[in-house]
C-alpha cells in the first residue's frame, strides 16, 4: 500500500534505534571521507525530520522519496566539493540520475588506514563512557571501508559487538574474553561483506536474471523440501531486498528484509523444518539465522532428473512455452539434489543444459540430439572436482604459507601486469581458502572452495575494473559471472608479457625484517617472489625452489647474526648474484 510519507512509514516499521543505525550506514557508505561527528549531526537532523513526519505525514517535504531526501541532505553539505571533488557534480542532476551518480562514486578501495582495534582497556573505557556512540563509531568505520556491506546484517554484527563488550568489559581478563569474540565477529563480517559485494556485482554487471538464478540454486540447496513455486516467491522478494540494499536504499531494504523473514516464518511448514529455531529469535537475529541456516535434509524418493528433462517428449515444448520457468525448474531440481556442488557449478550445468536445448530444439529430432545431455555435462562436474583435489593435495603438502607461494607464482604468470602488492594480497587470500576448505569432509570441500573463490575473484575484478592493467583479467571478469573461476584457472603463462628488467632494489633487505611480525615477514618475502616471477615468468619450479631456499637461508643467517645489518649489507648482493645465475 502507498504511504503518504515514506520516511515516516520506515521509521515506524524499523524503530528509532535501527532507523538511526541505517541512516548512519547510508551516509558513511556514500561519504566515506567525512568525519564521524559530521555524520552524527546529519543522522540527528534526519531522525528529527522523520519524527516530525510521523507526527504529521502531510508536513512539508514528508511526501518526498527517501532517496531524494538523502540526496538533498548530501548536496547541502558546504564542503562537499572540496572533500569529494566531482561527486558534487551529481547534485546538478535530477533523481533518479542523481542517485545513480552517487552510487558510481562509491569507492571499493578507499584510501583509509586499516581499522585498528584499540587495547581492551581503552575499548572498555570508551564503551562504558557512551555505548551508543561507541557502536555508532563501529558502524561508521565498517561502512566507510565496505560501502556495499549488507546494512541490516551490519546492524546484527554491531549488536554482537555490543554484547561481547557488555560481557567482557566486566571480566577479570578483558583481553582473554574479548580477543576471540571480536576476531570471530571480524572474520564473519568480512565474509559477509564479500558475499554482499558479489550479489551487488551480479545485479549491477550481469542483471536480475543472473542474480535470480544464483538465488534459486542457493535456496534450492538449503530448502530441498520446498516446492519450486515457494522458492520462486522467496527469490522474488530476496531480489527486491538485495536490489534495494545494493542501490543504497537501506531503510527500504531493512524493512523489506524483516517482511521476508516474517513471511518465511509464517510459511515454515512449506519451506524447511530448520526454520523453527530461527523464528523464535528477535528481528535482527532471526534474519541472520535464516541467512546462515543449515540445509534441510533431502526428501526421499526424488525421481531421476532425466525423467522430466531428457526422457519427456515435451521438453522443447516446455522450453518454448516458458523458457525461464522451465530452466528455473531444472536449476531447482538439480540444486536440491546436489547440496555438495558449488553455486557456480550448478549455474554452469544449467547454462550447459540451456545451450544444449537451444541447439537441439531447433533440430528435426530434438530428442535424439539431447538424449545424452547429462553425459555431455559431466566435464563441468569433473573439472572443479579434479582441481579441488589437486589443490588440496598441494595445500596438505606445502602448508598455508607454501601454498600461498605456489599461488603467487601461478597468478603472477597468469597476469604479470597486475601490481605486486595486489598479486600478493590475492595469493594470500586464495591460499587461505585451503585452510578454510581442505580440512572439510569431501561432501563440503567442493562448494566451500568454489564459493570462496567466487568472492575473492569478484573483489579482484572490482578493483581491476577501477584500474585495468590486463586484458586477460578484464576478459575473465566481464564475459560471464559463472565462468570467472574456470576462466582464471584456464589462464597459463602470459606469452605477450615482456619480462621486467632486473632491479636489485626489489631484492634488497635490511635488518628491520627480522623484527617484523610473522605475517608481515611473509608478505615481504612474497613480494620478492612475485618480483622474481615478473623478471623470469618462465622459470621452472626447480629454479624457483632453489632461489626460495637460498633466500630463506640468507634471512635466517642474517637474522641470527650479531651484527644483522652488516650481514644484510654483505650477503645481500651475493644472494642477488646467485639468484640471477640460478635463473639465467
Amino acid at each position: 500500500e502507498a504511504h503518504k510519507s515514506e520516511i515516516a512509514h520506515r521509521f515506524n516499521d524499523l524503530g528509532e534505534g535501527h532507523f538511526k543505525g541505517l541512516v548512519l550506514i547510508t551516509l558513511s557508505q556514500h561519504l566515506q571521507k567525512s568525519p564521524f561527528e559530521e555524520h552524527v549531526k546529519l543522522v540527528n537532523e534526519v531522525t528529527d525530520f522523520a519524527k516530525a513526519c510521523v507526527a504529521d505525514e502531510s508536513a512539508q517535504n514528508c511526501g518526498k522519496a527517501i532517496a531524494t531526501l538523502f540526496g538533498d541532505k548530501v548536496c547541502a553539505i558546504p564542503s562537499l566539493r572540496e572533500t569529494y571533488g566531482e561527486l558534487a557534480d551529481c547534485c546538478a542532476k535530477e533523481d533518479p540520475d542523481r542517485v545513480e551518480c552517487f552510487l558510481q562514486h562509491k569507492d571499493d578501495n578507499p584510501n583509509l588506514p586499516p581499522f585498528e582495534r584499540p587495547e581492551p582497556e581503552a575499548l572498555c573505557t570508551a564503551f562504558k563512557e557512551n555505548n551508543d556512540r561507541f557502536i555508532g563509531h563501529y558502524l561508521y568505520e565498517v561502512s566507510r571501508r565496505h560501502p556495499y556491506f549488507y546494512a541490516p546484517e551490519l546492524l546484527y554484527y554491531a549488536e554482537k559487538y555490543k554484547n561481547a563488550l557488555t560481557e567482557c568489559c566486566e571480566a577479570a581478563d578483558k583481553a582473554a574474553c574479548l580477543t576471540p569474540k571480536l576476531d570471530a565477529i571480524k572474520e564473519k563480517a568480512l565474509v559477509s561483506s564479500a558475499q554482499q559485494r558479489l550479489k551487488c556485482a551480479s545485479l549491477q554487471k550481469f542483471g536480475e536474471r543472473a542474480f535470480k538464478a544464483w538465488s534459486v540454486a542457493r535456496l534450492s540447496q538449503k530448502f530441498p523440501k520446498a516446492e519450486f513455486a515457494e522458492i520462486s516467491t522467496i527469490v522474488t522478494s530476496l531480489t527486491k531486498v538485495t536490489k534495494e540494499c545494493c542501490h543504497g536504499d537501506l531503510l527500504e531494504c531493512a524493512d523489506d528484509r524483516q517482511e521476508l523473514a516474517k513471511y518465511m516464518c509464517e510459511h515454515q511448514d512449506s519451506i524447511s523444518s530448520k526454520l523453527k529455531e530461527c523464528c523464535v529469535k528477535p528481528t535482527l537475529q532471526k534474519a541472520h539465522c535464516i541467512l546462515e541456516i543449515q540445509r534441510d535434509e533431502l526428501p526421499t524418493e526424488l525421481p531421476d532428473l532425466a525423467v522430466d528433462f531428457v526422457e519427456d517428449k515435451e521438453v522443447c515444448k516446455n522450453f518454448a512455452e516458458a523458457k525461464d520457468v522451465f530452466l528455473g525448474t531444472f536449476l531447482y531440481e538439480y540444486s536440491r539434489r546436489h547440496p555438495e556442488y558449488s553455486i557456480g557449478m550448478l549455474l554452469r550445468i544449467a547454462k550447459g543444459y540451456e545451450a544444449k536445448l537451444e541447439k537441439c530444439c531447433a533440430e528435426a529430432d530434438p530428442h535424439a540430439c539431447y538424449a545424452k545431455v547429462f553425459d555431455e555435462l559431466q566435464p563441468l562436474i569433473d573439472e572443479p572436482k579434479k582441481l579441488v583435489q589437486q589443490n588440496c593435495e598441494l595445500f596438505d603438502k606445502l602448508g598455508e604459507y607454501g601454498f600461498q607461494n605456489a599461488l603467487a607464482v601461478r597468478y603472477t604468470q597468469k597476469a604479470p601486469q597486475v601490481s605486486t602488492p595486489t598479486l600478493v594480497e590475492y595469493a594470500r587470500k586464495l591460499g587461505s581458502v585451503g585452510t578454510k576448505c581442505c580440512s572439510l569432509p569431501e561432501t563440503e570441500r567442493l562448494s566451500c572452495t568454489e564459493n570462496y573463490l567466487a568472492l575473492i575473484l569478484n573483489r579482484l575484478c572490482i578493483l581491476h575494473e577501477k584500474t585495468p592493467v590486463s586484458e586477460r583479467v578484464t576478459k575473465c571478469c566481464t564475459e560471464s559471472l559463472v565462468n570467472r573461476r574456470p576462466c582464471f584457472s584456464a589462464l597459463h603463462v602470459d606469452e605477450t608479457y615482456v619480462p621486467k628488467p632486473f632491479h636489485a632494489d626489489s631484492f634488497t633487505f635490511h635488518a628491520d625484517i627480522c623484527t617484523l611480525p610473522e605475517k608481515e615477514k611473509q608478505v615481504k618475502k612474497q613480494m620478492a617472489l612475485v618480483e622474481l616471477v615478473k623478471h623470469k615468468p618462465k622459470a621452472s619450479e626447480e629454479q624457483m625452489k632453489t632461489v626460495m631456499g637460498d633466500f630463506a637461508a640468507f634471512l635466517k643467517k642474517c637474522c641470527d647474526a650479531d651484527n644483522k645489518e652488516a650481514c644484510f649489507t654483505e650477503d645481500g648482493p651475493k644472494l642477488v648474484a646467485k639468484c640471477q645465475a640460478t635463473l639465467a
Epitope: 517428449k313 515435451e314 522443447c316 515444448k317 518454448a320 530444439c361 531447433a362 528435426a364 530434438p366
Partner: nanobody, 115 residues
Framework: DVQLVESGGGVVQPGNSLRLSCAAS????????MSWVRQAPGKGLEWVSS????????LYADSVKGRFTISRDNAKTTLYLQMNSLRPEDTAAYYC????????SGQGTLVTVSS
C-alpha cells in the same frame, strides 16, 4: 503466450490432396523444430513429420513417407503439411507441435478422407 492455430483441413476423396497450415506466435519460431501429429478417432496421438528450425532437415513416419511434405516459412512463422495421395487411414485431427512433442497445443484441424 505460445499460440498454434491449425487450418486447411476438410473432406476429400482418396487420392486427392490437401495443404495444412499452422500459424505460430509467442515464441522464437526459428529456434524450434516443429512437428505434425495426428489423432484418428478413438486412437492415441501418432507422430507424422518433423522439420528443423532452419527448414533444412525433415523426418517422416513410414506411413506417410513419399506422400506428405513438411515445410515452413520462417518469415511468416507458419508451418505447412502438403498431403498428396490421401488414403482413408489418413483420416484424423492434425495438430502442429513444438519440437518432438506428442501433445496437442492448438485446436487442430480435421481431415476426412472418404469416397
Amino acid at each position: 503466450d505460445v499460440q498454434l492455430v491449425e487450418s486447411g483441413g476438410g473432406v476429400v476423396q482418396p487420392g486427392n490432396s490437401l495443404r495444412l497450415s499452422c500459424a505460430a506466435s509467442g515464441f522464437t519460431f526459428t529456434s524450434f523444430g516443429m512437428s505434425w501429429v495426428r489423432q484418428a478417432p478413438g486412437k492415441g496421438l501418432e507422430w507424422v513429420s518433423s522439420i528443423s528450425g532452419s527448414g533444412s532437415d525433415t523426418l517422416y513416419a513410414d506411413s506417410v513417407k513419399g506422400r506428405f511434405t513438411i515445410s515452413r516459412d520462417n518469415a511468416k512463422t507458419t508451418l505447412y503439411l502438403q498431403m498428396n495421395s490421401l488414403r482413408p487411414e489418413d483420416t484424423a485431427a492434425y495438430y502442429c507441435t513444438i519440437g518432438g512433442s506428442l501433445s496437442r497445443s492448438g485446436q487442430g484441424t480435421l481431415v476426412t478422407v472418404s469416397s
